[in-house]
């Protein structure tokens, strides 16, 4: 999957554009937005009705390094009585996020942009049936 | 990718943190094995707290089109269709990476960019804040 | 022909393993979850374990969780069934079932059975 | 977990006769219960889903009705292929839970 050329005709290329090797890209890693918090309400991965734990994955060789990954706590959701309904299911929401890899060759490194899917939290769905034609 | 040389103190000095500026090959790896989206792409739907979903585009961005989530209603959808606000819908947050075109305009030139996506909805209980 | 056919069943002592096997034909493997459900001799129906699509969402029954272990491979269309420290009343005929859900999600009922494997746990 | 109560024990009838099998939950299971027909030597077969929905393939003679606890499979008009064992199954609560059965017989 190849980025894509800025498409827009008023998108000349600038002067000030840095010289890049063919088939690269120049890529500054100092993150804009770097401090930015996420202001997600308390605890909701307890309180949510498709409750869900996480983990982190650990990799030197990705940045960031640290990815975190949930996992729903049941098959079912948890109804009023605090039991598990399993007429409903608790299903992962997934978000795409670039992530890049250092790769070592011998003596040398080279970069690599990954996508990599992360599953962020879990949401309470109606299952439908499947009709056979 | 672009071999870069380690310096003269390969193999055993190797730096831990990433290089300010690197050069990246342009093809995007996908890692993403054990994801179907025909599964997923009515969740937003058949969600006890369904969500919309609307189109950020930004040309200068890669990638250039993210959806961003807005939860539907203040309470949760219950089995008879009706809203239970004593229930909440509340928006599941992620930060991600992207790439911004850096300087603009600039079809090789990126820098890594944080930003905040609401992902989807789910239904919590909510806390009851007591006064002391 | 839609068709589930179960294998790996036979005669063991009380606390060694045993790992069933599933094949499915004629449908959409991964599009489904599956389960298994066990009959003892002259008894009822009971579920003991369920698998997502993707291996992302398993259940099993309070009776053998901790010793089975429920598993899929998509790819060769089989769903597996991981008996450890079994006891003389895990004898039972198990069927493996697929389940009703669209979209490789639980219902939780099942619309096309196989004909079963034998498990007997004795010494 | 739910326990479900099916009655009679055993039914004895004749072919062309009116078949009326109940289900009893230990508590209130919505809609979300089915029924399965079970011939000696066979697996079992979903006939309904959801209380009231046939599943594929399945006779209309057959009929389902009820929610909450009190449940009711009815077949029409007996066949003689419809002599067998039937289970009714919930997946309201967390486990899914199978009656003991219902053997309907030819008397």
């Known amino acids: 999957r190849k980025i894509p050329k800025v498409g827009h005709t008023f998108f000349q290329k600038p002067e000030s554009c840095p010289p890049v090797p063919e088939g690269s890209m120049k890529l500054d890693t100092g993150i804009i937005n770097e401090n930015q918090r996420v202001s997600m309400s308390r605890n909701i991965e307890s309180r949510s009705t498709s409750p869900w734990n996480y983990t982190v994955t650990w990799d030197p060789n990705r940045y960031p390094s640290e990815v975190v990954q949930a996992q729903c706590k049941h098959l079912g959701c948890i109804n009023a009585q605090g039991k598990e309904d399993i007429s409903m299911n608790s299903v992962p929401i997934q978000q795409e996020t670039l992530v890049l890899r250092r790769k070592h060759q011998g003596c040398s490194v080279s970069f690599q942009l990954e996508k990599v899917l992360v599953t962020v939290g879990c949401t309470c769905v109606t299952p439908v049936v499947h009709h056979v034609q | 990718g672009i071999a870069i040389p380690r310096n003269s103190g390969c193999p055993n000095s190797e730096d831990k943190n990433f290089p300010r500026t690197v050069m990246v090959n342009l093809n995007i790896h996908n890692r993403n094995t054990s994801t179907n989206p025909k599964r997923s792409s009515d969740y937003y739907n058949r969600s006890t707290s369904p969500w919309n979903l609307h189109r950020n585009e930004d040309p200068e961005r890669y990638p250039s089109v993210i959806w961003e989530a807005k939860c539907r209603h203040l309470g949760c959808v219950k089995a008879d269709g009706n809203v239970d606000y004593h229930m909440n819908s509340v928006p599941i947050q992620q930060e991600i990476l992207v790439l911004r075109r850096e300087p603009r305009h600039c079809p090789n030139s990126f820098r890594l960019e944080k930003i905040l996506v609401s992902v989807g909805c789910t239904c919590v209980t909510p806390i009851v804040h007591h006064v002391a | 022909e839609v068709q589930l056919v179960e294998s790996g069943g036979g005669l063991v002592q009380p606390g060694r393993s045993l790992r069933l096997s599933c094949a499915a034909s004629g449908f959409t493997f991964d599009d489904f979850a599956m389960h298994w459900v066990r009959q003892a001799p002259g008894k009822g129906l009971e579920w003991v374990s369920g698998i997502n699509w993707n291996s992302g969402s398993i259940g099993y029954a309070d009776s053998v969780k901790g010793r089975f272990t429920i598993s899929r491979d998509n790819a060769k269309n089989s769903l597996y069934l991981q008996m450890n420290s079994l006891r003389a009343e895990d004898t039972a005929l198990y069927y493996c079932a697929k389940d009703i859900a669209a979209a490789g999600e639980f219902y939780f009922d099942m619309d096309v059975w196989g004909q079963g494997t034998t498990v007997t746990v004795s010494s | 977990e739910i326990v479900l109560t099916q009655s009679p024990a055993t039914l004895s009838l004749s072919p062309g006769e009116r078949a009326t099998l109940s289900c009893r939950a230990s508590?209130?299971?919505?809609?979300?219960l089915a029924w399965y027909q079970q011939k000696p030597g066979q697996a079992p077969r979903l006939l309904i889903y959801d209380a009231s929905n046939r599943a594929t393939g399945i006779p209309a003679r057959f009929s389902g009705s009820g929610s909450g606890t009190d449940f009711t499979l009815t077949i029409s008009s007996l066949e003689p292929e419809d002599f067998a064992v039937y289970y009714c199954q919930q997946r309201s609560n967390w486990p899914p839970t199978f009656g003991q059965g219902t053997k309907l017989e030819i008397k």
């Open positions: 508590q209130s299971v919505s809609s979300y």
